[in-house]
């Protein structure tokens, strides 16, 4: 799913207020819902009919530093016999997400939002038509 | 996938630098990769063997204001005949993502990161065990 463009109005003060100095805003420390419970994945990536692997990218100047990307293991989907069914296709499910980029020069530290496209997992689909023409 | 806890070290200045005043940081206006290309969705939510619907939540004090959540349509998966196969299960694929929360009191506007759990889509899995003993 796609994140709509900001149009930057979200980050602006109301028109009746003085503008934000230096093109930056105040970001409070701490994260709301940081401790929210996430249910365990239960290895769905291995038990799916469109299984996937994970790779982790690491960047110390990004929050979260660790971004996990899924890659579908097969082109086709896995049938009940454990064989690849080529009439069905394993396709990635992608999601735009926000991360925070840290920029520093000496003791001057600033942050900026960044959009990242993450492949979250894979699903098995029937192509609209079976053959190219 | 779960976003690791910050431990707040990410948002702190190096130890040798004076601390951030008032528990806030500088967030630059603008979003990196805002115009990145996202491939079309191609209705995979309808053509998946574990199809899903979308619902949109809207909050003007959140960026993005629109957060889309998927709900699996069925408990089982859809077979080649278009019937629900109850030996397989449609399960949600979830992803923790960041949003920005806007807080204002008059002309004083600040922002804070917030974790949101998003269901991005569904995938078809083989249950670990078929029957409860």
């Amino acid at each position: 799913r796609k994140i709509p463009k900001v149009g930057h109005t979200f980050f602006q003060k109301p028109e009746s207020c003085p503008p934000v100095p230096g093109g930056s805003m105040k970001l409070d420390i701490g994260i709301i819902n940081e401790n929210q419970r996430v249910s365990m994945s239960r290895n769905i990536e291995s038990r799916s009919t469109s299984p996937w692997n994970y790779t982790v990218t690491w960047d110390p100047n990004r929050y979260p530093s660790e971004v996990v990307q899924a890659q579908c293991r097969n082109l086709g989907c896995i049938n009940a016999q454990g064989k690849e069914d080529i009439s069905m296709n394993s396709v990635p499910i992608q999601q735009e997400t926000l991360v925070v980029r840290r920029k520093h020069q000496g003791c001057s530290v600033s942050f900026q939002l960044e959009k990242v496209l993450v492949t979250v997992g894979c699903t098995c689909v029937t192509p609209v038509i079976h053959h190219v023409q | 996938r779960k976003i690791p806890k910050v431990g707040h070290t990410f948002f702190q200045k190096p130890e040798s630098c004076p601390p951030v005043p008032g528990g806030s940081m500088k967030l630059d206006i603008g979003i990196i990769n805002e115009n990145q290309r996202v491939s079309m969705s191609r209705n995979i939510e309808s053509r998946s063997t574990s199809p899903w619907n979308y619902t949109v939540t809207w909050d003007p004090n959140r960026y993005p204001s629109e957060v889309v959540q998927a709900q699996c349509r069925n408990l089982g998966c859809i077979n080649a005949q278009g019937k629900e196969d109850i030996s397989m299960n449609s399960v949600p694929i979830q992803q923790e993502t960041l949003v920005v929360r806007r807080k204002h009191q008059g002309c004083s506007v600040s922002f804070q990161l917030e974790k949101v759990l998003v269901t991005v889509g569904c995938t078809c899995v083989t249950p670990v065990i078929h029957h409860v003993q």
Partner: antibody, heavy 123, light 106 residues
């Protein structure tokens, strides 16, 4: 128009490896699968496997698992097929061929072919 | 793997003749493709989904069949039809091809 341009002929010694490239143009490389097909002299065509540059998904013919490795460089719109531990029976013409996009057309539907790369294994 | 057997392996016919090539699968398949490969050239899709003509292919070519037995027919052979013809099953992994039928002009 869609074009698949393969690297030139190779002569290799037994036991060596070879990497054949296939440069795609005229379409969005990430959106379609790429397959590889072997044609040994006087033999039938053999499907080796296919790769999806977008998802990373790969499917191999069991006969080529451990022999062929399929990779892509999306930034260069190029697919690669590497053959290891070459033997005389690997002497063949190798074709890359574009498959479907998985959404509108099946991944396993082949429409466009490269011109072929001859790999000769000889001591 | 599904084995594909074509017959004949080679044939010679005169211009204007009706030519039939058959392909037998070791187990039932839903779809069959036919490819034409002219000497020194790349294979070209001729028939897909058993009976559908690929774009730009002359109407003298046709395909038929179901289950395990499939046929490629050229209603009136032309000199430019000299080639090797391959059937390919599109049903189960892996994709497999017939051994080819080499067609020559008498």
């Amino acid at each position: 128009q869609v074009q698949l341009v393969q690297s030139g002929a190779e002569v290799k010694k037994p036991g060596a490896s070879v990497k054949v490239s296939c440069k795609a143009s005229g379409y969005t490389f990430n959106e379609y699968t790429m397959h590889w097909v072997k044609q040994a002299p006087g033999q039938r065509l053999e499907w080796m496997g296919g790769i999806n540059p977008n998802s990373g998904g790969v499917s191999y013919n069991q006969n080529f698992k451990g022999k062929a490795t399929l990779t892509v460089d999306t930034s260069a719109s190029t697919a690669y097929m590497e053959l290891s531990s070459l033997r005389s029976e690997d002497t063949a013409v190798y074709y890359c061929a574009r498959g479907g996009d998985g959404y509108y057309t099946n991944y396993f539907d082949i429409d466009y072919w490269g011109q072929g790369t001859t790999v000769t294994v000889s001591s | 793997d599904i084995q594909m057997t074509q017959s004949p392996s080679s044939l010679s016919a005169s211009v204007g003749d009706r030519v039939t090539i058959t392909c037998s699968a070791s187990s039932s398949v839903n779809y069959m493709h036919w490819y034409q490969q002219k000497p020194g050239k790349v294979p070209k899709l001729l028939i897909y989904d058993t009976s559908k003509l690929a774009s730009g292919v002359p109407s003298r070519f046709s395909g038929s069949g179901s289950g395990t037995d499939f046929t490629l027919t050229i209603s009136s052979l032309q000199p430019e039809d000299v080639a090797t013809y391959y059937c390919q099953q599109w049903n189960s992994h892996p994709l497999t091809f017939g051994q080819g039928t080499k067609l020559e002009i008498k």
